[in-house]
Interface confidence: low
């Protein structure tokens, strides 16, 4: 039985040209995380964090994606095209797969606030 819950940074906004941290956290389960996949809104994989092998950043994103903190992902040099949904997929044993959703809005405005609160989607 899957008892865990994915908490995410929820809906966040950030300035064009700036950086943002995408963070998911798996709680309420003793399951061991074997791999975390990070996907963009078009379902293209940004990065993978394998518990044994470490990080793999996909070549198309190498210049703008930094691993961490933790199992999270840092997007840099944001463009308006980065606006959209991001998904973290936690592969665990013995529970199976958990998935979290984050919506990122990239704003032109210099007063854009980066909300770092955690919420359960």
């Amino acid at each position: 039985m899957m008892t865990g819950t994915i908490e995410t940074t929820g809906n966040i906004s950030a300035k064009k040209g700036g950086s943002v941290i995408l963070q998911c956290h798996l709680s309420s389960t003793m399951a061991q995380v074997t791999q975390v996949n990070w996907e963009q809104h078009d379902h293209s994989l940004l990065a993978i964090r394998n518990a044994e092998l470490g990080w793999h950043i996909y070549p198309a994103f190498k210049d703008r994606v930094a691993p961490g903190p933790g199992l999270g992902l840092t997007l840099q040099s944001l463009t308006m095209n980065d606006t959209g949904e991001y998904f973290c997929t936690y592969h665990t044993y013995p529970d199976g797969t958990y998935r979290g959703r984050i919506f990122l809005e990239v704003l032109e405005s210099s007063v854009a606030e980066h909300s770092a609160r955690f919420q359960i989607p």
């Epitope: 044994e52 092998l53 044993y93």
Partner: antibody
């Protein structure tokens, strides 16, 4: 075809070190970790650890920690296992094996699908 | 570390017999369980991975089942070339092997 070819048999004295090589061919070396397994005469299989050929990450069995070092040379598609401070109970056949774990499988398959022919290491005074 | 207990440690059987070997994990390992066959002087050979998936090229008389803590390797009709030692191995880090089951000719 896909294969792993290991270096030849070794005879070592207690306290010495041994380095076993494992040359891969027939597949993309950096796509899979290499695991090392040993088997003492007449005994079962013992997992020693593995190394990611992709980024050099290692994971060693706790009982060998501090005595074992696993490395790879991606230019020659070769993995190495060095065991130091040898004791008589290290006498065994040492196998390298391709570990099916990979970034592109969410599951930790961790099955060894291709094995080297084995290297006999004898530790004797 | 997760301990793997295999039983029996040895068994005698005849060609054509149905043979069952069991493997028990000290804690749940989901389906992260593999089976190998080893003949004297040879490297082990992967038979079954992920508890029940048959490795390419392995005869269909071999099958695996189970999940959680209890697993089974079945040889539906033992052939002369099947007399060997069989090992289970769990792949939750760190990997560990069972003690082996020697299948001998009755």
């Amino acid at each position: 075809q896909v294969q792993l070819v290991q270096s030849g048999a070794e005879v070592k004295k207690p306290g010495a070190s041994v380095k076993v090589s494992c040359k891969a061919s027939g597949y993309t070396f950096t796509s899979y970790p290499i695991g090392w397994v040993r088997q003492a005469p007449g005994q079962g299989l013992e997992w020693m650890g593995w190394i990611s050929s992709y980024n050099g990450n290692t994971n060693y069995a706790q009982k060998l920690q501090g005595r074992v070092t696993m490395t790879t040379d991606t230019s020659t598609s070769t993995a190495y296992m060095e065991l130091r401070s040898l004791r008589s109970d290290d006498t065994a056949v040492y196998y390298c094996a391709r570990d099916l774990s990979s970034f592109w499988s969410g599951d930790v398959l961790g099955a060894f699908d291709i094995w080297g022919q084995g290297t006999m290491v004898t530790v004797s005074s | 570390d997760i301990q793997m207990t295999q039983s029996p440690s040895s068994l005698s059987a005849s060609v054509g017999d149905r043979v069952t070997i069991t493997c028990r994990a000290s804690q749940s390992i989901s389906s992260y369980l593999n089976w190998y066959q080893q003949k004297p002087g040879k490297a082990p050979k992967l038979l079954i991975y992920a508890a029940s998936s048959l490795q390419s090229g392995v005869p269909s008389r071999f099958s695996g089942s189970g999940s959680g803590t209890d697993f089974t390797l079945t040889i539906s009709s033992l052939q002369p070339e099947d007399f060997a030692t069989y090992y289970c191995q769990q792949s939750v880090p760190p990997r560990t092997f069972g003690g082996g089951t020697k299948v001998e000719i009755k």
